[in-house]
Amino acid sequence: SERCDDWGLDTMRQIQVFEDEPARIKCPLFEHFLKFNYSTAHSAGLTLIWYWTRQDRDLEEPINFRLPENRISKEKDVLWFRPTLLNDTGNYTCMLRNTTYCSKVAFPLEVVQKDSCFNSPMKLPVHKLYIEYGIQRITCPNVDGYFPSSVKPTITWYMGCYKIQNFNNVIPEGMNLSFLIALISNNGNYTCVVTYPENGRTFHLTRTLTVKVVGSPKNAVPPVIHSPNDHVVYEKEPGEELLIPCTVYFSFLMDSRNEVWWTIDGKKPDDITIDVTINESISHSRTEDETRTQILSIKKVTSEDLKRSYVCHARSAKGEVAKAAKVKQKVPAPRYTVELACGFGAT
């Protein structure tokens, strides 16, 4: 066969679906690789072909579209499973071609088992809710296109293993789940089970997501530098190690980049001819407020280093702050035998 533009195995789209549930998988060519859509391709005389490689096999084989009850079918650029089976796991390829053109991409599909409490190896999306922020909603994800708008499915929501009924501040409202006032106690995994009829059969879609309650923008503040501060003086003798921690608190802010950096004499440490190392550690509170600590260290400090200006800077979407460390050369204590003894009239 003639050459085909092969986009390889698209591991970025590691698709996971639950066993014994419907799954609709769009060919990624039109979403991420080609500049035209399926309709344009189809009307230009291009054909979409599907095939797969079973798990732990090397052999590419055509997909069997002649299974009972049309268990696997293709509709436009979508591959349908009604429902999936565990051994559907493998690498799937969609190829778009005619006599003069060919393009293909493969992607992994994993069919996953779940237990009665919806626990599974499925990677869960995380939805962040602001603490004590008023009514916020989550929506049952990835259910579009499974049934027509004329079909009215039943939706049941669970927190962990428990059906959500008569919960204090969590109210199921069809495809949405409303949190009247989100609290830390609302952290956890929430599952919606969507049940709908199709051709005399009943199908279930299970979607689980993790809810994480985070700091509210109402309470967000610019970064706060706890250290260095005006109360601590770093007094050192030449030759000693100088260690200055910069500890900064950042309020949680959605999509904010938190930055901490040191300047020495107004310059980046890399631009100063001293042997300085900086180590960073990061910790998070329960509401994902962040504390970053950057420790600046100079193994053997010189008297020149003790005159330098050491400033810790911090920046978030809320603003920029800076604080200088007070660094001093230690005044050597008097040597008793000489200085003090002379004071007592010794000769």
């Epitope: 107004g266 005159k307 330098r308 400033v311 460390a325 007070k326 050369q329």
Partner: antibody, heavy 121, light 107 residues
Framework: EVQLQQSGAELVKPGASVRLSCTSS????????MHWVKQRTEQGLEWVGR????????QYAPNFQDKATITVDTSSNTVYLQLSSLTSEDTAVYYC??????????????WGQGTLVTVSP | DIQMTQTTSSLSASLGDRVTISCRAS??????LNWYQQKPDGTVKLLIY???TLHSGVPSRFSGSGSGTDYSLTISNLEPEDIATYYC?????????FGSGTKLEIK
């Protein structure tokens, strides 16, 4: 509040010396390097030098090595700039200033009001 | 010494205008550049340090940018109190040096 109060204008004769003062308040002078700059009429700023009040160590721009002497009296929170062998070229406004942060910070945030030195026979 | 050149010695603009003042270094100064404002009465203020960091209390209409040898100070919406002379200052190499200043006047 950080304040730098400079001494009044000086009219001096060529060949003489002059000592300008800059008295600080609102901070501990020993924590910050103190600097001086020169500004001639309708011209830019020229860095003269600086002193570390902690130990009196000074550093000067090459052009001012033999012209300027910076000293400090920490008991009165005052920095001095002495200019010697004055010529008409030394006629200028001299500013003292303090950096934003401790030590050798290059961000010059707090400035005195300036002292005009006029060298005239 | 590093030479700092402010080619425009004076600039006339109308209130509300966006004004850009430029400064060129005789060699790469790695963003180690500050901007100062000197009012007609001689008062000097730090506006921006390290090319683009606004000093506290400075209005957000002031901004700085640049890299290598070319830097600029922008006032986005000129106000009457912005009438002053603006100086750039490099601290990349000793001794620190300043530009000759750009005097901003109202049309």
């Amino acid at each position: 509040e950080v304040q730098l109060q400079q001494s009044g204008a000086e009219l001096v004769k060529p060949g003489a010396s002059v000592r300008l003062s800059c008295t600080s308040s609102g901070f501990n002078i020993k924590d910050y390097f103190m600097h001086w700059v020169k500004q001639r009429t309708e011209q830019g700023l020229e860095w003269v030098g600086r002193i570390d009040p902690e130990d009196g160590e000074t550093q000067y721009a090459p052009n001012f090595q033999d012209k300027a002497t910076i000293t400090v009296d920490t008991s009165s929170n005052t920095v001095y700039l002495q200019l010697s062998s004055l010529t008409s070229e030394d006629t200028a406004v001299y500013y003292c200033f303090r950096p934003l942060y401790y030590g050798n910070s290059p961000w010059f945030a707090y400035w005195g009001q300036g002292t005009l030195v006029t060298v005239s026979p | 010494d590093i030479q700092m050149t402010q080619t425009t010695s004076s600039l006339s603009a109308s209130l509300g205008d966006r004004v850009t003042i430029s400064c060129r270094a005789s060699q790469d100064i790695s963003n180690y550049l500050n901007w100062y404002q000197q009012k007609p009465d001689g008062t000097v203020k730090l506006l921006i340090y390290y090319t683009s960091t606004l000093h506290s209390g400075v209005p957000s209409r002031f901004s700085g940018s640049g890299s290598g040898t070319d830097y600029s100070l922008t006032i986005s919406n000129l106000e009457p109190e912005d009438i002053a002379t603006y100086y750039c200052h490099q601290y990349s190499k000793f001794p620190p040096t300043f530009g000759s200043g750009t005097k901003l006047e109202i049309k």
